[in-house]
């Protein structure tokens, strides 16, 4: 049943004498395993015997025995799937039909495979794309319908007989579908490759030549041109003639049109291979080329730079940068059209030649205000000297210079005066737009160049101003030197350190915190009476009479300032004690008599003691001793003693006389 056998393998296999052939093959015998396999060469069916006749190249039987002469041919298959075969070496007479006779337990099949063995290695085949254009990458393919595991080969590419540098990718196929060896080469042809021979060479493993295929490259490209100019250096002077010739060195396909370009722009009515320029002007300087087109596109020649030489034109000056800030760097560039380029320059600042400046550029590393002005230049080349152009203006900007704060008032300034200050400067660019003053008020305010300080304070020490344009320049501060009367005048006791006792040595100091001017005079005063003119008031031995209200005055040329009144207190023991009697020193018995201990003391007497004529202390301690009713026996001499924190004092004796009343005399 033929439908039960399915085979897959290449229809024809190619090889050459001495090589080998590898036949990839698969099959399916659906009724069971293969029991017998015979490989015939050119098999023919014999109807009489119902068998195939032909040369048996290989035979395998149930017992697996293979004749020894069959080693050249190998069956590499199995009993149910694989029917791969190898013939190594293969011979010319192996060409023809190979028959695979397969038998299973119940079925038989003959499968035919064509084998083409040539006498010599057959050439590979080069495949090219339909069109090749310059600089466009193409893939060249070299294909050989041969591959065998036992016979390694290689394909090499050559251009004009020289191996090509580009790396080729070789691939092989040994499958039931196809058997081949292929080499692919990626290649970007240039116009110069047009007409060149490309070879794919078949070599054995040792690099020995076996066969090859060649093709001639047809590289489509734009016209390749050469331009020739007379004179050859393309340097002329105004009025000379110039001839340019365009030659086509290669074009594929043939060219169709010709044109000339100057600086990339087409020249009208110039459609021949020769360009004649008569009596050239400097405007005709530029880059010339010819352009020839074909179906691929336009081709351009190299550019010829035609230089029409002329003397420098009037120059202009370019400044980098104006306005310039003082201290910055500035570059001046002299621009003058000339051919050849100027070799020498003359520079002018405000019409005066700048010595030693002969270059196209002038660089000033540190600009100063005096550099401002007009800069012009003159350019010179071998054909002559140009004219001086209009020049360029350099504006040098800088902060205000020499800023000073000036006091407008007549000196000296006195406390409370209105002071006027002005902010002056020498120069400024750009102009001064505002001023600042130090110290600032709490609310910064716009200020003119004049500052009025009304009711100037005594401590208004220094003032500074700034004149401002884009920058502020501060003046050195000026001292107002405000003059004022002595301040904070006060009396200070230097000694003694503790309270003043009568008899102490006492020194009072007249202090003040500040005075301007510093030269001062002192005055001491007590109760409107001048006491002294020194800073100190000294008492060698203070007495209670010195106590009182003292003031000191400090004078300078601006005015005088008095201290607050200072009370001088002298402490002394009770003194000038005396006993006064009321109503008198003679009192009638029965009446009332009051004895008072009068004294002068500081602090006041705190304690009194009374004594009688026997110096007996009486049990009375107040300032007044009251006798009521007074008796005759109270008559006698009394004295008192006063005590304070400083000491004690006693009075002299005072005699009290108590006389009898008329009643007592009457009773006697």
């Amino acid at each position: 049943d033929s439908s039960k056998w399915v085979f897959e393998h290449p229809e024809t296999l190619y090889a050459w004498e001495g090589a080998c052939v590898w036949i990839p093959c698969t099959y399916r015998a659906l009724d069971g395993d293969l029991e017998s396999f015979i490989l015939f060469h050119n098999p023919e069916y014999n109807k009489n015997t119902s068998k195939f006749d032909g040369t048996r190249l290989y035979e395998s039987t149930k017992d697996g025995k293979v004749p020894s002469e069959q080693k050249r041919v190998q069956f590499l298959g199995d009993k149910n799937k694989n029917c791969t075969l190898s013939i190594h070496p293969v011979h010319l007479n192996d060409s023809g039909q190979l028959g695979l006779r397969m038998e299973s337990k119940t079925e038989k099949w003959m499968e035919r495979i064509h084998l083409n063995v040539s006498e010599r290695p057959f050439p590979p085949h080069i495949q090219l794309p339909p069109e090749i254009q310059e600089s466009q990458e193409v893939t060249l393919t070299c294909l050989l319908n041969f591959s065998c595991y036992g016979y390694p080969i290689q394909l090499q590419w050559l251009l004009e007989g020289v191996p090509m540098r580009q790396a080729a990718v070789t691939s092989t196929s040994l499958t039931i579908k196809s058997v081949f060896t292929r080499s692919e080469l990626k290649f970007s042809p240039q116009w110069s490759h047009h007409g060149k021979i490309v070879t794919c060479q078949l070599q054995d493993a040792d690099g020995k030549f076996l066969s090859n295929d060649t093709v001639q490259l047809n590289v489509k490209h734009t016209p390749k041109l050469e331009i020739k100019v007379t004179p050859s250096d393309a340097i002329v002077r105004e009025g000379d003639s110039v001839t340019m010739t365009c030659e086509v060195s290669s074009s594929n396909p043939e060219y169709t049109t010709v044109s000339w370009l100057k600086d990339g722009t087409s020249l009208k009515k110039q459609n021949t291979f020769t360009l004649n320029l008569r009596e050239v002007t400097k405007d005709q300087s530029g880059k010339y080329c010819c352009q020839v087109s074909n179906d691929v596109g336009p081709g351009r020649s190299e550019e010829v730079f035609l230089q029409v030489q002329y003397a420098p034109e009037p120059s202009t000056v370019q400044i980098l940068h104006s306005p310039a800030v003082e201290g910055s760097q500035v570059e001046f560039l002299c621009m003058s059209l000339a051919n050849p380029l100027p070799t020498n320059y003359t520079w002018y600042h405000n019409g005066k030649e700048m010595q030693g400046r002969t270059e196209e550029k002038v660089h000033i590393p540190k600009i100063l205000p005096w550099h401002a002005g007009t800069y012009s230049c003159v350019a010179e080349n071998i054909l002559g000297t140009g004219q001086r152009g209009p020049g360029a203006e350099l504006d040098v900007q800088y902060p205000p210079k020499k800023v000073t704060t000036v006091i407008q008032n007549p000196m000296p300034i006195r406390e409370g005066d209105t002071v006027t200050l002005s902010c002056n400067y020498n120069s400024s660019n750009p102009s001064v737009t505002r001023y600042e003053w130090k110290p600032h008020g709490a609310w910064e305010e716009p200020s003119l160049g004049v500052l009025k300080i009304q009711n100037v304070g005594w401590d208004n020490t220094t003032i500074a101003c700034a004149a401002c344009n884009s920058w502020c320049s501060w003046a050195s501060p000026v001292a107002l030197n405000v003059q004022y009367a002595p301040r904070d005048v006060r009396v200070r006791k230097i000694k003694p350190l503790s309270e003043i006792h009568s008899g102490n040595s006492v020194s009072l100091q007249c202090d003040f915190s500040s005075s301007h001017p510093k030269e001062v005079q002192f005055f001491w005063e007590k109760n409107g009476r001048l006491l002294g003119k020194e800073s100190q008031l000294n008492f060698d031995s203070i007495s209670p009479e010195d106590a009182g209200s003292y003031s000191c005055w400090v004078n300078n040329s601006i005015g005088q300032t008095a201290s607050k009144a200072w009370t001088l207190e002298v402490l002394y023991a009770p003194r000038r004690l005396r006993v006064s009697m009321s109503p008198g020193d003679q009192v009638m018995e029965g009446k009332s008599a009051t004895l008072t201990c009068e004294s002068d003391a500081n602090p006041p007497v705190s304690h009194y003691t009374w004594f009688d004529w026997n110096n007996q202390s009486l049990p009375y301690h107040s300032q007044k001793l009251r006798l009521e009713p007074v008796k005759v026996q109270h008559s006698g001499a009394y004295w008192c003693q006063g005590t304070n924190s400083v000491g004690k004092g006693r009075s002299p004796l005072s005699t009290l006389t108590v006389y009898y009343s008329p009643e007592t005399i009457g009773r006697r």
Epitope: R434, K438, P439, H440, G441, A442, W443, E444, E445, P446, I453, G457, W458, D459, N460
Partner: antibody
């Protein structure tokens, strides 16, 4: 007599906007640099910003906490300074005073509650 | 926080002398004038002292200002009950390019 009168205060939600005005009289307004100062409830005084006179450039300067949110402008023809307050925050609450630096006169203030 | 530093409170009895201090730095008090403002309850601040120690007309001579280095002080002598108010110092600040204030001192007349 120099006089400044603020207006435009009120209640606004956080993120909202308000525009205060300060009308001046009794001095040459166009020459003066004008200031805004604010006072949070129970707190001290804080400078908000100022605008210079047109002759001094007419530019405005601002304290850091309000920069980018508040804009001071002036209309010399109306003797008026404005404070445009955007993206208001709760900490912007307070009394806003306008001051002329020239005479150090303060307005009566206008209250802003955020 | 305020750029200039003042004590939060001060007090005194009628007739007494009270001093309020204000401390700053070289960029404000150290190089610029000091101003003092009085703010009575519910009113706008009023200028009391300008240019360190100058009094505007109408301000009693009981109020005096002084400055030394980076500090300033306001002295009120003969204290009166109507002096009870908040007192603020102010100065221009060169670094901030604007005026700066102290946190204020609440003066109580006992």
């Amino acid at each position: 007599e120099v006089q400044l009168v603020e207006s435009g205060g009120g209640l606004v939600k956080p993120g909202g906007s308000l525009r205060l005005s300060c009308v001046a009289s009794g001095f040459t307004f166009s020459n003066a640099w004008m200031n805004w100062v604010r006072q949070a409830p129970g707190k001290g005084l804080e400078w908000v910003g100022r605008i210079k006179s047109k002759t001094d450039g007419g530019t405005a300067d601002y304290a850091a906490p309000v920069k980018g949110r508040f804009t001071i402008s002036r209309d010399d023809s109306k003797n008026t300074m404005y404070l445009q307050m955007n993206s208001l925050k709760t900490e912007d609450t307070g009394v806003y005073y306008c001051i002329t630096g020239a005479t150090d006169v303060w307005g009566q203030g206008t209250t802003v509650t955020v | 926080s305020y750029v200039l530093t003042q004590p939060p409170s001060a007090s005194g009895t009628p007739g007494q002398r009270v001093t309020i201090s204000c401390s700053g730095s070289s960029s404000n008090i150290g190089s610029n004038y000091v101003y003092w403002y009085q703010q009575l309850p519910g009113t706008a601040p009023k200028l009391l002292i300008y240019r360190n120690n100058q009094r505007p007309s109408g301000v009693p001579d009981r109020f005096s200002g002084s400055k030394s280095g980076t500090s300033a002080s306001l002295a009120i002598s003969g204290l009166r009950s109507e002096d009870e108010a908040d007192y603020y110092c102010a100065a221009w600040d060169d670094s901030l390019s604007g005026p700066v204030f102290g946190g204020g001192t609440k003066l109580t007349v006992l």
